[in-house]
C-alpha cells in the first residue's frame, strides 16, 4: 500500500538505504513530498515488524515497486493512496 503523508516533523530521514526489501516484509510505503521543513522527497518503508527504513528514492527496486503498486491501484479497487497527517 502506498501512502502520501504530510507531517509536521521536518525531515524524518537522515540516512537512506538502497538495499532491497522483499515485498513480504513490507507493511506500507510512505511517500513524503518535499516541503513542510524538509527540502527533499522521502520514502519510508514500514516493515511488518514495526521497524522503518528510509529508502533512497533513486533506488531502482523502490521505483519499480511503486510503479507496480500504482498500476495495480489504478486498475482495481479504490486507489490505496491516501493523503493523511498523523496529528
Amino acid at each position: 500500500v502506498l501512502e502520501v503523508y504530510y507531517t509536521s516533523l521536518r525531515c524524518r530521514c537522515v540516512q537512506e538505504s538502497s538495499v532491497f526489501i522483499p515485498r513480504r516484509f513490507i507493511d506500507r510505503i510512505q511517500i513524503l513530498p518535499r516541503g513542510n521543513g524538509c527540502p527533499r522527497k522521502e520514502i519510508i518503508v514500514w516493515k511488518k515488524n514495526k521497524s522503518i527504513v528510509c529508502v533512497d528514492p533513486q533506488a531502482e527496486w523502490i521505483q519499480r515497486m511503486m510503479e507496480v503498486l500504482r498500476k495495480r491501484s489504478s486498475s482495481t479497487l479504490p486507489v490505496p493512496v491516501f493523503k493523511r497527517k498523523i496529528p
Epitope: E3, L9, C13, D27, S51, I86, P87
Partner: antibody
Framework: QVQLQESGPGLVKPSETLSLTCTVS??????????VGWIRQPPGKGLEWIAH???????RYNPALKSRVTISKDTSKNQFSLKLSSVTAADTAVYYC???????????????WGQGTTVTVSS | DIQMTQSPSSLSASVGDRVTITCRAS??????????MHWYQQKPGKAPKLLIF???DLESGVPSRFSGSGSGTDFTLTISSLQPEDFATYYC?????????FGQGTKLEIK
C-alpha cells in the same frame, strides 16, 4: 486536540488483577502508525514502560512484566486497557496512558500523556 | 535492556543559570543516522511532558531555552537561562531497542 484519560480503581488487593482503561479523543486508535501504551511511576521513583499496542493489534511488553500484563484496545469505543495480574505492593504507582508520536514505529517516543491515575495495592 | 544513567541525580540552581543534565546509555541508541533519545519534564503531581525528541529536536511549544545534543551513548539537555517554571524533574528515554527505557531522573531544585 489529542487527549487521554485514565480510569480504574484506586485500590487493589494483593494477588488480585489491576484493570485500567484509557479513553482517548482527537485521534483514532486504528490510524496507520498509531500506537498507545502504559507507563507507571512508583511513589518517589522514576518512569517504567509497561506495554504498548499498535493500530494493527501488535502488542509489545516490558519483559520484566510480560507474564502478568495484558494490553488490549477497543477501537469502537476509543479505549485501550491494561490488566496486571497477581499484584503486590511493588505495583503501587501512578499509571499513565500515553500516545506514541507515530513517526518511527518501533523506535518512537511518547508525545502525549494522560494525567495519570494512582493505584494502591493494599489489603 | 539498555540502561540509562542520568547525572546528576539532583541539582540546585538559580533563576538565570545555565544548566546541563547528562544521560548515558549502556549502548548506542543510534540508528539510521538518528539518535533515538528523548527528554521529558515532569512537575510534581503532573504527567511527564515531551521536551526534546531525536536527541535535539524541540517539541512544538517548548521554549527555545531548552536544547538537546549528543549521539551514540552520551547526551545532554541544556537549559540556557533557568526560569522559575523550569524547576522540575527531567527524564531521558531511549527507544532504539525494546524495551524502551528511562533514566532515573534529575531533580532540578531552586538554590
Amino acid at each position: 486536540q489529542v487527549q487521554l484519560q485514565e480510569s480504574g480503581p484506586g485500590l487493589v488487593k494483593p494477588s488480585e488483577t489491576l484493570s485500567l482503561t484509557c479513553t482517548v479523543s482527537g485521534f483514532s486508535l486504528s490510524t496507520f502508525g498509531m500506537g498507545v501504551g502504559w507507563i507507571r511511576q512508583p511513589p518517589g521513583k522514576g518512569l517504567e514502560w509497561i506495554a504498548h499496542i499498535w493500530w494493527d493489534d501488535d502488542r509489545r511488553y516490558n519483559p520484566a512484566l510480560k507474564s502478568r500484563v495484558t494490553i488490549s484496545k477497543d477501537t469502537s469505543k476509543n479505549q485501550f486497557s491494561l490488566k496486571l495480574s497477581s499484584v503486590t505492593a511493588a505495583d503501587t504507582a501512578v499509571y499513565y496512558c500515553a500516545r506514541i508520536a507515530g513517526y518511527y514505529g518501533s523506535r518512537d517516543w511518547f508525545a502525549y500523556w494522560g494525567q495519570g491515575t494512582t493505584v494502591t495495592v493494599s489489603s | 535492556d539498555i540502561q540509562m544513567t542520568q547525572s546528576p541525580s539532583s541539582l540546585s540552581a538559580s533563576v538565570g543559570d545555565r544548566v546541563t543534565i547528562t544521560c548515558r546509555a549502556s549502548e548506542s541508541v543510534d540508528n539510521m543516522g538518528i539518535s533515538f533519545m528523548h527528554w521529558y519534564q515532569q512537575k510534581p503531581g503532573k504527567a511527564p511532558k515531551l521536551l526534546i525528541f531525536r536527541a535535539s529536536d524541540l517539541e512544538s511549544g517548548v521554549p527555545s531555552r531548552f536544547s538537546g545534543s549528543g549521539s551514540g551513548t552520551d547526551f545532554t539537555l541544556t537549559i540556557s537561562s533557568l526560569q522559575p517554571e523550569d524547576f522540575a524533574t527531567y527524564y531521558c528515554q531511549q527507544s532504539n531497542k525494546d524495551p524502551w527505557t528511562f533514566g532515573q531522573g534529575t531533580k532540578l531544585e531552586i538554590k
